[in-house]
């Protein structure tokens, strides 16, 4: 039986040009995590991350996608054509895949501030 | 330039082990993740497992998970791969290769080293 | 485990051919796929990696493509020295698994 949540950042907006944190956070399971898969809205990949082997970062994104803090993704150097979902995919065992969901808006505003804040979807 | 000299042919009975070695240099050991496959004559390649010099972490493949293990000795540059209870299916090639920083594909392979299990 | 089915196992063609092979993947790999050449008594070399992207080094003619389930490997034309056998390997999740490779001689 699944019991874990996925808590993520939620709706997030942040400045074109500048950088953003992605993150999720696996609770409420004792299940070890395997690997964790971040996709973007078109669900391509944009990195993996395998507990024991380490980041795989996709070419694509290789500029501009560093990793971590932990298990989330740091994206930087926004454009306008980042405005969209990402999902972070956990895989764990015993209790299978979990899935959780950011929306991420850029911002032509040189005001815009960055708000994250975590949620369960 | 990025080197893997693996150690040389070995040939053993079933049920011994054998221990293969990988010495690596032209790069910073620890950087990359170190992965073992073996090919038996006329197959596929098989992927064993992969260890994490930085960590020591370690991720097999469930048909070898008991009978395989992977260790590093940073100092020295070197992974090893040994497995146990050999039995004549194990005959083999075996080879080292690392993985792309930040990439998962096989950029850099060892020569191989034949392992023969024959009674 | 996802199982990764190649084709055709063999393929005779001659020096100048568009040559072409196919890998199929038994569960969606995103574009989580790379191709090996390895010639006879040699270890495998790298040639394509993430599915489509030239490693460093690789001529111009061999190319990738595909993602999901679907991958092909172009050779766009066949060379002497490209007689090899050929494999795909995806490393979406572990265990890490290769195709069982596409033998290719010259006619």
């Known amino acids: 039986m699944m019991t874990g949540t996925i808590e993520t950042t939620g709706n997030i907006s942040a400045k074109k040009g500048g950088s953003v944190i992605l993150q999720c956070h696996l609770s409420s399971t004792m299940a070890q995590v395997t690997q964790v898969n971040w996709e973007q809205h078109d669900h391509s990949l944009l990195a993996i991350r395998n507990a024991e082997l380490g980041w795989h970062i996709y070419p694509a994104f290789k500029d501009r996608v560093a990793p971590g803090p932990g298990l989330g993704l740091t994206l930087q150097s926004l454009t306008m054509n980042d405005t969209g979902e990402y999902f972070c995919t956990y895989h764990t065992y015993p209790d299978g895949t979990y899935r959780g969901r950011i929306f991420l808006e850029v911002l032509e505003s040189s005001v815009a501030e960055h708000s994250a804040r975590f949620q369960i979807p | 330039q990025v080197q893997l000299v693996q150690s040389g042919a070995e040939v053993k009975k079933p049920g011994a082990s054998v221990k293969v070695s990988c010495k690596a240099s032209?790069?910073?050991?620890?950087?990359?993740?170190m992965h073992w496959v073996r090919q038996a004559p006329g197959q596929r390649l098989e992927w064993i497992g992969g260890?994490?010099?930085?960590?020591?972490?370690?991720s097999y493949s469930q048909k070898f998970q008991g009978r395989a293990t992977l260790t590093v000795d940073t100092s020295a540059s070197t992974a090893y791969m040994e497995l146990s209870s050999l039995r004549s299916e194990d005959t083999a090639v075996y080879y080292c290769t690392r993985s792309s920083y930040y990439r998962y594909d096989l950029d850099y392979w060892g020569q191989g080293t034949t392992v023969t299990v024959s009674s | 485990d996802i199982q990764m089915t190649q084709s055709p196992s063999s393929l005779s063609a001659s020096v100048g051919d568009r040559v072409t092979i196919t890998c199929q993947a038994s569960q969606d790999i995103k574009t989580a796929l790379a191709w090996y050449q390895q010639k006879p008594g040699k270890a495998p070399k790298l040639l394509i990696y993430s599915a489509s992207y030239r490693y460093t080094g690789v001529p111009s003619r061999f190319s990738g493509s595909g993602s999901g389930t679907d991958f092909t490997f172009t050779i766009s034309s066949l060379q002497p020295e490209d007689i090899a056998t050929y494999y795909c390997?995806?490393?979406?999740?572990?265990?890490?698994?290769f195709g069982g490779g596409t033998k290719l001689e010259i006619k």
């Open positions: 032209g790069y910073t050991f620890t950087e990359n993740a």
């Open positions: 260890i994490n010099p930085n960590q020591g972490g370690t």
């Open positions: 390997h995806q490393h979406y999740t572990t265990p890490w698994t």
